[in-house]
């Protein structure tokens, strides 16, 4: 049925970038400026997205594809297809309802977007803090305290033979 219908439907011959113009005996007319059709057989063209205000044009609207927007400097995209622009903050900050706020002690953010995240807890991995964390940087974990004790070899000893039935850590 679909095949029969498409053979009879003159609109199915209209390629992307055109629309099936009922006012002109179903002839395929080009999409007018500031509109597009991304698929064939369409009876109307869609209006192009306008990148205004905090948005800026990344790619113009063509007859077959919508415009692509980006955010002006100082803002970054959020959502599918950059549907929103969110204010950038400095590294070491996060965006709150009251604007950009410094990360609390024990957290960091190394980007201009996103939230402050807790410093890595080195002791959970049996390691020690080699470099302290800041608002902008995570801590750097170093060898475990035992590895740093006097008399400890600086050469890594060979790994012990793995016991059967134990999975690697």
């Amino acid at each position: 049925f679909e095949r029969t219908r498409s053979l009879q439907d003159p609109c199915s011959n209209c390629p992307a970038g055109t629309f099936c113009d009922n006012n002109r005996n179903q002839i395929c007319s080009p999409c007018p400026p500031n509109s597009f059709s991304s698929a064939g057989g369409q009876r109307t063209c869609d209006i192009c997205r306008q990148c205004k205000g905090v948005f800026r044009t990344r790619k113009e609207c063509s007859s077959t594809s919508n415009a692509e927007c980006d955010c002006t400097p100082g803002f970054h995209c959020l959502g599918a297809g950059c549907s929103m622009c969110e204010q950038d903050c400095k590294q070491g900050q996060e965006l709150t309802k009251k604007g950009c706020k410094d990360c609390c002690f024990g957290t960091f953010n190394d980007q201009k977007r996103g939230i402050c995240r807790p410093w890595t807890n080195c002791s959970l991995d049996g390691k020690s803090v080699l470099v302290n964390g800041t608002k902008e940087r995570d801590v750097v974990c170093g060898p475990s305290p035992a590895d740093l004790s006097p008399g400890a070899s600086s050469v890594t000893p060979p790994a012990p033979a793995r016991e059967p039935g134990h999975s690697p850590q």
Epitope: G17, T18, P30, C31, P33, C51, R58, K59, E60, C61
Partner: antibody
Framework: SVEESGGRLVTPGTPLTLTCTVS????????MIWVRQAPGEGLEYIGF?????FTYYASWAKGRFIISRTSTTVDLKMTSLTVADTATYFC????????????WGPGTLVTVSS | DVVMTQTPASVSEPVGGAVTIKCQAS??????LAWYQQKPGQPPKLLIY???TLASGVSSRFKGSGSGTEFTLTISDLECADAATYYC??????????????FGGGTEVVVK
């Protein structure tokens, strides 16, 4: 209006920057385009900087040509010039938010010869 | 790359006659095509864009049509001032920041 400048006789390998100066409209509201035409030949689309400040280049021009802008000028920086780059270089404004050039400058001639 | 093949290379018609110029794209470009007129020693002039939209200040004697890969420029009621070279040009985006906004080879129109 649109007007190009900076065209001159250079030797192969010499870098050259062309400048497009506009008046009567705001550059950052339009696509600003560079096109060239070798003597007696057809038109060749080089690339453009769009209203958002993003640059696009023809595949043959990418890496050798750089388009940039200020509030009143658009530059075309050209490197590794060869005799084949001898042409009149046109700057133009895009029509209606597109990269179709509609307002053209008179062009500036670049001659590359040893 | 998108190749634009323009025919004929040259055409001669009398005043009051009509000229048809064809442009074929090597792949579908929707309706992203423009037509330009260029006279010796002058920059090109945009006549038509989006395949059929007349540019500002251009005579309605110029008519563009077509979509996909086949496009036509028709100049009716020819005048001496129409003697020029005519170019088609597509808009086509590749990957990243590469474009294939290719011009056709041009058609010289002689008005007798």
């Amino acid at each position: 209006s649109v007007e190009e400048s900076g065209g001159r006789l250079v030797t192969p390998g010499t870098p050259l920057t062309l400048t497009c100066t506009v008046s009567g409209f705001t550059i950052n509201s339009y696509h600003m385009i560079w096109v060239r035409q070798a003597p007696g030949e057809g038109l060749e689309y080089i690339g453009f900087i769009n209203d958002g400040g993003f640059t696009y280049y023809a595949s043959w021009a990418k890496g050798r040509f750089i388009i940039s802008r200020t509030s009143t000028t658009v530059d075309l920086k050209m490197t590794s010039l060869t005799v084949a780059d001898t042409a009149t270089y046109f700057c133009a404004r895009g029509v209606d938010g597109t990269s179709y050039p509609d307002l053209w400058g008179p062009g500036t001639l670049v001659t590359v010869s040893s | 790359d998108v190749v634009m093949t323009q025919t004929p290379a040259s055409v001669s018609e009398p005043v009051g006659g009509a000229v048809t110029i064809k442009c074929q794209a090597s792949q579908s470009i929707g309706s992203d095509l423009a037509w330009y007129q260029q006279k010796p020693g002058q920059p090109p002039k945009l006549l038509i864009y989006r395949a059929s939209t007349l540019a500002s200040g251009v005579s309605s004697r110029f008519k563009g049509s077509g979509s996909g890969t086949e496009f036509t420029l028709t100049i009716s009621d020819l005048e001496c001032a129409d003697a020029a070279t005519y170019y088609c040009q597509c808009i086509y985006y590749g990957s990243d920041d590469v474009i294939y906004h290719t011009f056709g080879g041009g058609t010289e129109v002689v008005v007798k």
